[in-house]
Every structure is written in structure tokens, then in C-alpha cells.
């Protein structure tokens, strides 16, 4: 057993038909001695008197607030949660695994930049009583500044029959260096409470390798005299890390037409035109990657030909 | 990724060519070795990151852009030392700290090119022959150096008596690689800086 | 004490269905992960499908995928195996299982698909 | 599919020790832990082992587990008669848990 927070405990339990559970000792916290009585959640059936309850903790209804009282009048509370282990493993019932970049990823980050700064979030199909809190470090031995936000629903979506819950959260790295050489991960910890089910989930991660730049802005297309051609031409994200000769991007440039089965045209450069033959109907689009270290393609931006 | 790469221009900042050659051939090693190399923990998630480097040579502080000097969590240690400069440095205006940079970015190289000849060296007499360095990347390390043509004492090549461990070699490799690579990357991103100058 | 009682094997042809149940005693079933695990005869065990505690995730072998489906019926305390479109390699003793560090099996029963 | 390659067959006298390995790779022993279930003829599998060393109650103290990186064994000091089964190492792959992933078998066979 161990303490989340102030009065809040975490039960850890080896989770399968038949164990023998935990025996956990509550100390109710008051100078009293005598006349202490003991009772769970709203029930008022004593469970004990004293100013320790030894219980048997094996099931989810042996979990949750314990308060000692003394003539009605309660002296204090222990929330009791459970952290289930299976067969070694502990559990992940709380969240989806989002399956990508492989299995078992249960919470994905993504930086627009080198500043320091990254977004995580992670799925779930819960509603209701449920809470997140978010601790990041830099390294784990001996852990650096990361300041997280707090975590906040951040779209909702309908998958099947099932309704699908987006949370995310900023943290910014206390000093960054962008042009540094990282030598320590960054260490995300989320702490995921639903009702009486603890559960934690971590993700270990280079910030150069989920950078993900913004797509390239201010896309404008020039014809070209006497010529099917177009000079296709773009800017830096807003976003991205300055100066743009030391952290350079290269870029992908397509011209889709509209159906989805024709061939697409696909340019590569490094610089911000491109001249491309514009067809009838098609768009043209371009997306953004670090020049030097392949991590994500930002998202199209795109124009329409005509 | 391989895609379609723009030959540099004569008049282009000498070292730019080389150091963008620097990186896809590091790049491809690594990405050999992955492969090679999958029994092996050889991935970034497994590695422990460590930088041969590291007290000898401060290339990320000495090549800091211009840009970035104000943000004081770039300029925690900033010791280097001056050597005087090379062929790289096209013109007269080149600052001290320029010619310290390209200094910095020589002695990072040559470091490199004994731990990885002394490695080629051991992986050459392991029964498996299972992964060798690649000599294009090698001649690319010397083709920079040249280019950047700084005067400094040859470092000789590490010899070791004792037999070697190539499970821990291979390992060795793998942290070798996964470092020049992201050294290669600084050293790409400061030529690309450069030439802009 | 837990018990799990299976039923619902017998010989059956390629190409049909067949559906096996395991019943479960003695702990509460809602709150756990099943499997179902299978041995040909004379070969190893080969692991085919699990279930989580409240149904909401499913887990298939390869072998099995899109042909066996895993489900659990909380109220009465069973879990299933709808097996389809079975083949001959499908013949073995299938054995239901719950999840954890110490685990308990059903008795096993024994499917046989042949013409 | 095996991932977890067990020898097919060991065998001892009474009295002896006998040893079975469990080999695999990084992503599955590697990373997880390690079950070994003996199985007697026409009986469904017996846990002797969890948690790579730790013996259920009811387990006579003469099997012991062990793990070692990407690898694990199960060892029979004072082989009885009434041991001779079959035995199967279990883990898990990280990337694909909670799919069990069994160990090919080993059947032990005590002689005289």
C-alpha cells in the first residue's frame, strides 16, 4: 500500500480468482483513544471500533472512503483504491491502446518544435468518475524539470456503438535548449483514477523523435505564362524552431486529382517553391519534415488548381 | 528516405556537400545495423545514449546559431579552444567562434573515426562476420575532415590484447552509431547555417 | 472453491459451427479475464482467445481470427467459444482458463471435426 | 508459431536433477514473466511455477524456476516417479499480450 495523495491510498493486488488479497491497517488520524467506530463509503454499518481497522482487502467492494467517527462526528477519511497486477502485468483498463506507432501505446506525444514544449494525449470509452494527473521528467535517476498542465477532454467521438473520450496536456520542458543533442528521454507518468481502479501509464520519448511540424503556411499557386505549369510556393510554419537555416525543413509537394485512385505527382525539396503541372480538378498539397532527422510529416496543406 | 537529392552549387560553403553525405551515410549504417543487428538491443528505445565526446569537444555550444545565444539554457558550458582555421572557412570575416565551431566539429570526427576503425578492427575477426562498418561512410568522415582541413595531432588507433567480446562490440556499435548520428545531424543543421551566412 | 465446468464439444463437420461453454463457480467471474486454450492431440497447448473482465476487448490467434468468437455472459456466469466454418485442423481438447499469476482450468473437451 | 523453444524430451533416474530450458527473445522472457505447468496424460495443465521462481502452495519444494535475460528453466532436484510428464514453459509478448505464448513442451521421462 502506498500514498497517491493526502489520504488517498493505493492497494496493489496480485488480481486473480481466489487470492488472498492484502491486509491493510487503517490509523484513524485524532489524539482520541476511545469510543472510535469505523464504517465504508455511505453505509453506516460498523465495521470495527478503535483507533486502528485491520480489513482483508481482495475485491473492488472492499476498496473505497473509510472514515472513523467518534459520536457522530467524523474524524477522518481513507480512500482506498485498487491497482490491479495480472499474472505480472499490470493492468490497462482505463485507457484504449491507440495500437500506433505499435501495440501497447497507450498515451502518444507530439512536438510542433525544439522549444521544449510537447502535447500527449490518450483515448478511453469511460465517462464518468474519471480523473488524470500528469507528472514529466527528464530522465529518471536524477529527473529534470517538465511542467505539465492539467489534463482536459479534448474531443469526443462516436466509434461503432461506442462513444470514444480524447484527453490531452501541454508540458514544457523547464530549459530547453533547442539546438541541444537530447542524451535523456523525457518520462511521462499518467496517473488514470476511475471510481475505485487506479492505474499508471507511462511513455518514454526524444523530443526530436515525435517532432511533427505544423504544415507549411501561406500556400499560393503563380501560373506560369504560356504553360500548364504552376510555381507552387509556401512559408515556415509559424510554429517551428528559429532560424530556419540551422533547423531547416524539406518538403513534399503532390498534386492529387480528384478521385483517390489517380496516380498523385510528388515532388521533393528543400526549398519553398516548387513548379508542378497543375491538372483540371486536382489540388495541389505540401507537407513539412525535419530536413535532417526523419521523424512525422506534418499535415497537408492544400489549394485547389483551378 | 531516399529522395531526390540537388548536387550543391561550386560556389556553396565547401563543407555543406560533405556533411549532408556525412549523414545519409551514417543514416544507412544505422539502419544496416538495426536490421543486422535485430537479436541485439540496437533500437533508440534500448540503447543507453552516450557520447564519446562528451567533455572533449562542445560543438553544440560552440556552433550555437547567433539566434539562439540569448536563450541561456543553450550557453550552460560553453569551454572550447581554439585552433586556427581551416579550408571551410571561405572568408575573412569568419568569426573566432566560427573558426572554434569548425574546430570543434574536426576533433568530433577524428574521435569518431578511431573508436569506429578499432571497432571495424574487432567486428573483422568475429566467426559470424555477421556486421562490418561501411567504408563509404568512413571515406565520407575522411572526405569532411579533409575538407575542413584543421591541424591537429593524429590520434593513434586504440589497441586492445584481450579477446574481443563481440556481443559487447556489436552492442558498443549500435550506441555509436545512434550517437554519430545525431552528431551528424547538428553538424548538417550547422553547415546548412552556415552556408545561409 | 473455483470451478469452471465446460461443455459443448462433440464431432462435427468441416465447415459447420459448433459452440463451447465454461462455467464458472466459486469467485467473482465479472471481475476477471478468460482464455481459451487448445491442444491437438499428441501436440503442445495453443493459446486462442481471450476475453477482458467486462467483454470490452477481445483477442484472437491468427489461426482463429475472423472464424472463432469469444464472448461472456456475466449474468450467468459463462463464457463461450462460437466456433465457425471449423476445419480439421481445428481438432483438439479445448480448455477455458481464467487470467491471472495463478490460474484454474476448466476439464477440457474435446472437438473433433472430421467428414 | 512457437516462440518459446523448449528440448523435446530429458530424462533421470529417481533422485536426480533434472533441468528444463525455456528460451525466447527479448520482447517476450526478456520482458515478462515466466509460468511452468506440468501436464500428466489426459489431464488438463498444472501451474508449478509463477512469476519466474515463486511456487504455488500444494507445489512439493523440489521444483524451482529461474530466469536469466531471454531465457528461463524449470528444475526437478530428486526426480520422482510420478513426475514424469509433460512440461510447458508460458510468457508473454509485450506487443501482443494478453495472448499466451507457450513453450513447444518437453516430456520428462524417469527411467528404471
Known amino acids: 500500500i502506498w500514498e497517491l495523495k493526502k489520504d488517498v491510498y493505493v492497494v496493489e493486488l496480485d488480481w486473480y480468482p481466489d487470492a488472498p488479497g492484502e491486509m491493510v491497517v487503517l490509523t484513524c488520524d485524532t489524539p482520541e483513544e476511545d469510543g472510535i467506530t469505523w464504517t465504508l463509503d455511505q453505509s453506516s454499518e460498523v465495521l470495527g471500533s478503535g483507533k486502528t481497522l485491520t480489513i482483508q482487502v481482495k475485491e473492488f467492494g472492499d476498496a473505497g472512503q473509510y472514515t472513523c467517527h467518534k459520536g457522530g462526528e467524523v474524524l477522518s477519511h481513507s480512500l482506498l483504491l485498487l491497482h490491479k497486477k495480472e499474472d505480472g502485468i499490470w493492468s490497462t483498463d482505463i485507457l484504449k491502446d491507440q495500437k500506433e506507432p505499435k501495440n501497447k501505446t497507450f498515451l502518444r506525444c507530439e512536438a510542433k518544435n525544439y522549444s521544449g514544449r510537447f502535447t500527449c494525449w490518450w483515448l478511453t470509452t469511460i465517462s464518468t468518475d474519471l480523473t488524470f494527473s500528469v507528472k514529466s521528467s527528464r530522465g529518471s535517476s536524477d529527473p529534470q524539470g517538465v511542467t505539465c498542465g492539467a489534463a482536459t477532454l479534448s474531443a469526443e467521438r462516436v466509434r461503432g456503438d461506442n462513444k470514444e473520450y480524447e484527453y490531452s496536456v501541454e508540458c514544457q520542458e523547464d530549459s530547453a535548449c533547442p539546438a541541444a543533442e537530447e542524451s535523456l528521454p523525457i518520462e511521462v507518468m499518467v496517473d488514470a483514477v476511475h471510481k475505485l481502479k487506479y492505474e499508471n501509464y507511462t511513455s518514454s520519448f526524444f523530443i526530436r523523435d515525435i517532432i511533427k511540424p505544423d504544415p507549411p503556411k501561406n500556400l499560393q499557386l503563380k501560373p506560369l505564362k504560356n504553360s500548364r505549369q504552376v510555381e507552387v510556393s509556401w512559408e515556415y510554419p509559424d510554429t517551428w524552431s528559429t532560424p530556419h537555416s540551422y533547423f531547416s525543413l524539406t518538403f513534399c509537394v503532390q498534386v492529387q486529382g480528384k478521385s483517390k485512385r489517380e496516380k498523385k505527382d510528388r515532388v521533393f525539396t528543400d526549398k519553398t517553391s516548387a513548379t508542378v503541372i497543375c491538372r483540371k480538378n486536382a489540388s495541389i498539397s505540401v507537407r513539412a519534415q525535419d530536413r535532417y532527422y526523419s521523424s512525422s510529416w506534418s499535415e497537408w496543406a492544400s489549394v485547389p488548381c483551378s | 528516405r531516399n529522395l531526390p537529392v540537388a548536387t550543391p552549387d561550386p560556389g556553396m560553403f565547401p563543407c555543406l556537400h560533405h556533411s549532408q553525405n556525412l549523414l545519409r551515410a551514417v543514416s544507412n549504417m544505422l539502419q544496416k545495423a538495426r536490421q543486422t543487428l535485430e537479436f541485439y538491443p540496437c533500437t533508440s528505445e534500448e540503447i543507453d545514449h552516450e557520447d564519446i565526446t562528451k567533455d572533449k569537444t562542445s560543438t553544440v555550444e560552440a556552433c550555437l546559431p547567433l539566434e539562439l545565444t540569448k536563450n541561456e539554457s543553450c550557453l550552460n558550458s560553453r569551454e572550447t579552444s581554439f585552433i586556427t582555421n581551416g579550408s571551410c572557412l571561405a572568408s575573412r570575416k569568419t568569426s573566432f567562434m566560427m573558426a572554434l565551431c569548425l574546430s570543434s566539429i574536426y576533433e568530433d570526427l577524428k574521435m569518431y573515426q578511431v573508436e569506429f576503425k578499432t571497432m571495424n578492427a574487432k567486428l573483422l575477426m568475429d566467426p559470424k562476420r555477421q556486421i562490418f562498418l561501411d567504408q563509404n561512410m568512413l571515406a565520407v568522415i575522411d572526405e569532411l575532415m579533409q575538407a575542413l582541413n584543421f591541424n591537429s595531432e593524429t590520434v593513434p588507433q586504440k589497441s586492445s590484447l584481450e579477446e574481443p567480446d563481440f556481443y559487447k562490440t556489436k552492442i558498443k556499435l549500435c550506441i555509436l552509431l545512434h550517437a554519430f548520428r545525431i552528431r551528424a545531424v547538428t553538424i548538417d543543421r550547422v553547415m546548412s547555417y552556415l552556408n545561409a551566412s | 472453491q473455483v470451478q469452471l465446468v465446460q461443455s459443448g464439444g462433440g464431432v462435427v463437420q468441416p465447415g459447420r459451427s459448433l459452440r463451447l461453454s465454461c462455467a464458472a463457480s466459486?469467485?467473482?467471474?465479472?471481475?476477471?479475464?478468460m482464455h481459451w486454450v487448445r491442444q491437438a492431440p499428441g501436440k503442445g497447448l495453443e493459446w486462442v482467445a481471450f476475453?477482458?473482465?467486462?467483454?470490452?476487448?477481445?483477442y484472437y490467434a491468427d489461426s482463429v481470427k475472423g472464424r472463432f468468437t469469444i464472448s461472456r455472459d456475466n449474468s450467468k456466469n459463462t463464457l463461450y467459444l462460437q466456433m465457425k466454418s471449423l476445419r480439421a485442423e481445428d481438432t483438439a481438447v479445448y480448455y477455458c482458463?481464467?487470467?491471472?499469476?495463478?490460474?484454474?482450468w476448466g476439464q477440457g473437451t474435446m472437438v473433433t471435426v472430421s467428414s | 508459431s512457437y516462440v518459446l523453444t523448449q528440448p523435446p524430451s530429458v530424462s533421470g533416474t529417481p533422485g536426480q536433477r533434472v533441468t528444463i530450458s525455456c528460451s525466447g527473445g527479448?520482447?517476450?522472457?526478456?520482458?515478462?514473466?515466466v509460468k511452468w505447468y506440468q501436464q500428466l496424460p489426459g489431464t488438463a495443465p498444472k501451474l508449478l511455477i509463477y512469476?519466474?521462481?515463486r511456487r504455488p502452495s500444494g507445489v512439493p519444494d523440489r521444483f524451482s524456476g529461474s530466469k536469466s535475460g531471454t531465457s528461463a528453466s524449470l528444475a526437478i532436484t530428486g526426480v520422482q516417479a510420478e513426475d514424469e510428464a509433460d512440461y510447458y514453459c508460458?510468457?508473454?509478448?509485450?506487443?501482443?499480450?494478453?495472448?499466451?505464448?507457450f513453450g513447444t513442451g518437453t516430456k520428462v521421462t524417469v527411467l528404471g
Open positions: 527479448r520482447s517476450n522472457i526478456g520482458s515478462n514473466t
Open positions: 482458463k481464467t487470467h491471472g499469476s495463478h490460474d484454474n
Open positions: 466459486g469467485f467473482t467471474f465479472s471481475s476477471y479475464g
Open positions: 508460458q510468457s508473454y509478448d509485450r506487443g501482443t499480450h494478453p495472448a499466451l505464448l
Open positions: 512469476g519466474n521462481d
Open positions: 476475453i477482458r473482465y467486462d467483454g470490452s476487448n477481445k
